[in-house]
Interface confidence: low
C-alpha cells in the first residue's frame, strides 16, 4: 500500500456526519436490515479511523481543532485512504492488502522481528513455523513474558476462538488453529478454544440451536487439524457459560470493570444496539483468565495465557488487557496474523457467506481448481509476451499469497516467487503450483474430518483436567 | 470411581531394595502428576516424591534422593517407587496421591489406602 | 524439623470454633497456595482445603481456610466429634523444589 496519510480530520469528521445521516434516513425508511447494517458498519468505521487519527473520540459538536492541510490537486488525485479494521470489518484500498506496519503502529503492538523469532526458536528448540518466518503471524504483546516464564518453567495456556457463523468453513479460518497446534506441540501446553455461538446468535439472523449447531459442527473441523484431546478443551458459550460458574464469575466481574462508553469507543456500539451485542466482548474476554477453567486450572488465577488470533480480534484483548490488572488477572499476551486474502484479492477479509470468495473445506478437487484458475486475483500481464518481458506481480497476485500459506517449502516458494517476477513462471502455471497444494491438503483434512465422531467431539467439549508435562 | 491401590510393601533389611506400585483406576492416569507421600509410625506427612503427567519432571524430598526412584507407566495405570539403599528412618506407611493440580502443587485429591514399608535387621 | 509450623494439638467441645494455624515462609505459603488434608484414625489423608479457601464438592462449609503473607489458617466451626483427627497443612516450596507439610495438628473434640 502506498505510504500516504490518511484523509484529513475535517474530511472525516464531515464523512462521520453524512454518513450519521444517511444510517438515520435509512432506519427512517423502509430500507433492508442489510442496507442499515452496511451502512452502520461504515459509520463505526468512520468514527473508528477518526478515533485512530485524533486520538479521541468523535463527538458531533467538536469539529477537530486543527485540521490538517487538504489536498489542492482535486479528488481524483487523493492518496489512498487509511486501512480500516476492527473485528466486523477490514477494509483497504490497496491489491497489497492491509500495510501491517501501520497497523503496528496505530494498534500499539510490536512486531515480530528475527530477534523474537530465534527466541522462540531457541526456546522450543524445533524450527520456527512457516506463518512466523514469512510474518504470517507478525505482531505480537508480552510473547517475551510468555518466554520468560516457559523458560523459568513457570505455565502458559493457549487460547483461541471460532466464531461459527455457518456450518462452511475456508482455509483462511485454518490459519490461526494450524498456528496454534504448533504452539501447543512444541510447548506443550494445555488449549482451550472458544466457539462464540452466543455471538453469532446476538450478531446473525439465527436460533439458538442454529448457533449451537453451527458451533458443533466446526468443531469438527477444528479438531481435524490434529490438537491433541488430552491438552485441548474446546467449548460452546451458549453450553459452558450454564455449567461453568468459575467463566461466569469472570465474565460479571469483567463487565463490571468496563464501562458503556468503553465498548462505545472500542467496538462503535451504538445505543440501537441490543444489550447482548454490548455485554459479549466480556465473554470473549473471560477465557484469557485460568480461573474460567477450574477443571484444568482448579482455582489458580496467575496463570499466563497467550492468545493467538487475527489482528482483527484485537481490540476484544486490548479491552482485556486493560481491565486484567483492575481484577487482579495477569494480561493475556497476543500473537496476531494478517489476513487470509479473498480469491478476488487483498483488499478485503474474506466471507464465508460469498462461495467464490474462499476455498471452502467442503470443497470437491474439481471445485477448487475451478475457483482458482476463475476466481483467484492474478498479478500477472495482460499478454503472454508482456508477462514473459516484465514479469508478475507476487504483491498483489492471490495465488501467490496462499502459496505463502500453504506451500511450506521455503526453496520451492522462493523459486516460484523468482520465475514470476522474472515471467518464466506464467500465471497458468502458478495457478496449477497453487491447485496442486490446495487439493491434497483439503482432501486431507476431509478424510480427518470423516474420523472426527460425535464421541470424539463430546470429549473435546466435555470440561475435564487436561493432560500435559511442564517441564 | 477413583482407586489407588498400593502393594509391594513388605519387611526389608538395611540396605536393601523395595519396589512399590500403586495400580489406579476409574480416571485418566496419564493426566495426573502423581506423588509418593509417607507417614513414619506415630508421625506427620512427609512427602517423598512426584512425577509429571508425561513422566518429564520428577522431584525428590532431600531425605531420599539418589535412594529413590519414582516412575510411571501409562499403558499400565501404574506409579512405581524404586527403593534402594534403604535405612531405618524409612520405616513408614507409603501412600500415592493424585494430583489434581496441572503443576505439581499438591493438589492431591485422592490418596491410597498406603502399604507398608518396614527396615529392620 | 517440619518446614510449616503447626501447633501440635488444638482442642474444643461441640458446637464450638477452633483454629489451626500454619506458619511458612516466603518460598512456600508466601507465594504458593496452602492445603489442608485431614487424617481421620486409622486412614489415608483427606484433601479439606485446596488454594487456600476452597472446598472439594462433600466437604461441609464448616471447615475454612484463609491465607495471609506467609501463614495460613483451618477454621473449624460447628464442632462436631467426628471432626477428631489430624490435620495437616501443605504446600509447595519453591527453594527446595519440593512439597512441604506441617507437623501435624491433633485436634480433640472435648
Known amino acids: 500500500m502506498p505510504n500516504s496519510e490518511p484523509a484529513s480530520l475535517l474530511e472525516l469528521f464531515n464523512s462521520i456526519a453524512t454518513q450519521g445521516e444517511l444510517v438515520r434516513s435509512l432506519k427512517a425508511g423502509n430500507a433492508s436490515k442489510d442496507e442499515i447494517d452496511s451502512a452502520v458498519k461504515m459509520l463505526v468505521s468512520l468514527k473508528m479511523s477518526y478515533k485512530a487519527a485524533a486520538g479521541e473520540d468523535y463527538k458531533a459538536d467538536c469539529p477537530p481543532g486543527n485540521p490538517a492541510p487538504t489536498s489542492n490537486h482535486g479528488p481524483d488525485a487523493t492518496e489512498a485512504e487509511e486501512d480500516f479494521v476492527d473485528p466486523w470489518t477490514v477494509q483497504t484500498s490497496s491489491a497489497k492488502g492491509i500495510d501491517y506496519d501501520k497497523l503496528i503502529v496505530r494498534f500499539g503492538s510490536s512486531k515480530i522481528d528475527k530477534e523474537l523469532i530465534n527466541r522462540i526458536e531457541r526456546a522450543t528448540g524445533q524450527r520456527p513455523h512457516h506463518f512466523l518466518r514469512r510474518g504470517i503471524f507478525f505482531s505480537h504483546r508480552d510473547m517475551n513474558q510468555v518466554l520468560d516464564a516457559y523458560e523459568n518453567k513457570k505455565p502458559f495456556y493457549l487460547y483461541t476462538g471460532r466464531g461459527p457463523s455457518s456450518e462452511a468453513m475456508h482455509v483462511g479460518h485454518l490459519i490461526p488453529f494450524i498456528f496454534t497446534k504448533w504452539l501447543q506441540d512444541v510447548f506443550n501446553v494445555p488449549l482451550v478454544i472458544q466457539m462464540t455461538d452466543d455471538e453469532k446468535y446476538l450478531w446473525k439472523d439465527l436460533t439458538l440451536d442454529q448457533a449451537y449447531s453451527y458451533a458443533v459442527e466446526n468443531a469438527k473441523d477444528i479438531i481435524a487439524c490434529g490438537f491433541d484431546i488430552n491438552k485441548t478443551f474446546i467449548f460452546s458459550d451458549l453450553d459452558y457459560m450454564g455449567m461453568s460458574s468459575g467463566f461466569y464469575k469472570n465474565v460479571v466481574k469483567i463487565q463490571k470493570h468496563v464501562t458503556f462508553n468503553q465498548v462505545k469507543g472500542i467496538f462503535g456500539f451504538t445505543d440501537s444496539d441490543c444489550i447482548g451485542k454490548i455485554s459479549f466482548p466480556a465473554i470473549q474476554a473471560a477465557p484469557s483468565f485460568s480461573n474460567s477453567f477450574p477443571q484444568i486450572f482448579r482455582d489458580r488465577t496467575d496463570i499466563q495465557c497467550l492468545i493467538p488470533c487475527a489482528i482483527d480480534q484485537d481490540p476484544y484483548f486490548r479491552m482485556t488487557r486493560d481491565v486484567a490488572p483492575r481484577i487482579g488477572y495477569p494480561k493475556p499476551a497476543l500473537l496476531h496474523s494478517t489476513f487470509f486474502p479473498a480469491l478476488q484479492g487483498a483488499q478485503t477479509k474474506m466471507s464465508a457467506s460469498d462461495p467464490n470468495s474462499s476455498i471452502f473445506l467442503t470443497d470437491t478437487a474439481k471445485q477448487i481448481k475451478t475457483k482458482v484458475n476463475k476466481h483467484a486475483f492474478s498479478g500477472g500481464r495482460d499478454t503472454i509476451e508482456e508477462h514473459r518481458q516484465f514479469g508478475g506481480n507476487c504483491d498483489v497476485d492471490v495465488s501467490f499469497m496462499y502459496l505463502t500459506f500453504f506451500l511450506e517449502d521455503d526453496d520451492k516458494l522462493e523459486q516460484i516467487r523468482k520465475d514470476y517476477t522474472s515471467g518464466a513462471m506464467l500465471t497458468g502455471e502458478l495457478k496449477k503450483a497453487l491447485i496442486e497444494v490446495l487439493q491434497p491438503l483439503i482432501a486431507e483434512h476431509q478424510a480427518r474430518r470423516k474420523e472426527v465422531t460425535d464421541e470424539i467431539v463430546k470429549e473435546f467439549m466435555t470440561p475435564r483436567k487436561l493432560s500435559f508435562d511442564f517441564q | 470411581e477413583v482407586q489407588l491401590l498400593e502393594s509391594g510393601g513388605g519387611l526389608v533389611q538395611p540396605g536393601g531394595s523395595l519396589r512399590l506400585s500403586c495400580a489406579a483406576s476409574g480416571f485418566t492416569f496419564s493426566s495426573y502428576d502423581m506423588s509418593w507421600v509417607r507417614q513414619a509410625p506415630g508421625k506427620g506427612l512427609e512427602w517423598v516424591s512426584a512425577?509429571?503427567?508425561?513422566?518429564?519432571?520428577?522431584y525428590y524430598a532431600d531425605s531420599v534422593k539418589g535412594r529413590f526412584t519414582i516412575s510411571r507407566d501409562n499403558s499400565k495405570n501404574t506409579l512405581y517407587l524404586q527403593m534402594n539403599s534403604l535405612r531405618a528412618e524409612d520405616t513408614a506407611v507409603y501412600y500415592c496421591?493424585?494430583?489434581?493440580?496441572?503443576?505439581?502443587?499438591?493438589?492431591?485429591?485422592?490418596w491410597g489406602q498406603g502399604t507398608l514399608v518396614t527396615v529392620s535387621s | 524439623q517440619s518446614v510449616l509450623t503447626q501447633p501440635p494439638s488444638a482442642s474444643g467441645t461441640p458446637g464450638q470454633r477452633v483454629t489451626i494455624s500454619c506458619t511458612g515462609s516466603s518460598s512456600n505459603i508466601g507465594s504458593n497456595y496452602v492445603y489442608w488434608y485431614q487424617q481421620l484414625p486409622g486412614t489415608a489423608p483427606k484433601l479439606l482445603i485446596y488454594a487456600n479457601s476452597q472446598r472439594p464438592s462433600g466437604v461441609p462449609d464448616r471447615f475454612s481456610g484463609s491465607k495471609s503473607g506467609t501463614s495460613a489458617s483451618l477454621a473449624i466451626s460447628g464442632l462436631r466429634s467426628e471432626d477428631e483427627a489430624d490435620y495437616y497443612c501443605g504446600a509447595w516450596d519453591d527453594s527446595l523444589s519440593a512439597y512441604v507439610f506441617g507437623g501435624g495438628t491433633k485436634l480433640t473434640v472435648l
Open positions: 512425577i509429571s503427567s508425561g513422566g518429564s519432571s520428577i
Open positions: 496421591a493424585r494430583d489434581v493440580a496441572w503443576d505439581m502443587l499438591g493438589d492431591f485429591d485422592y
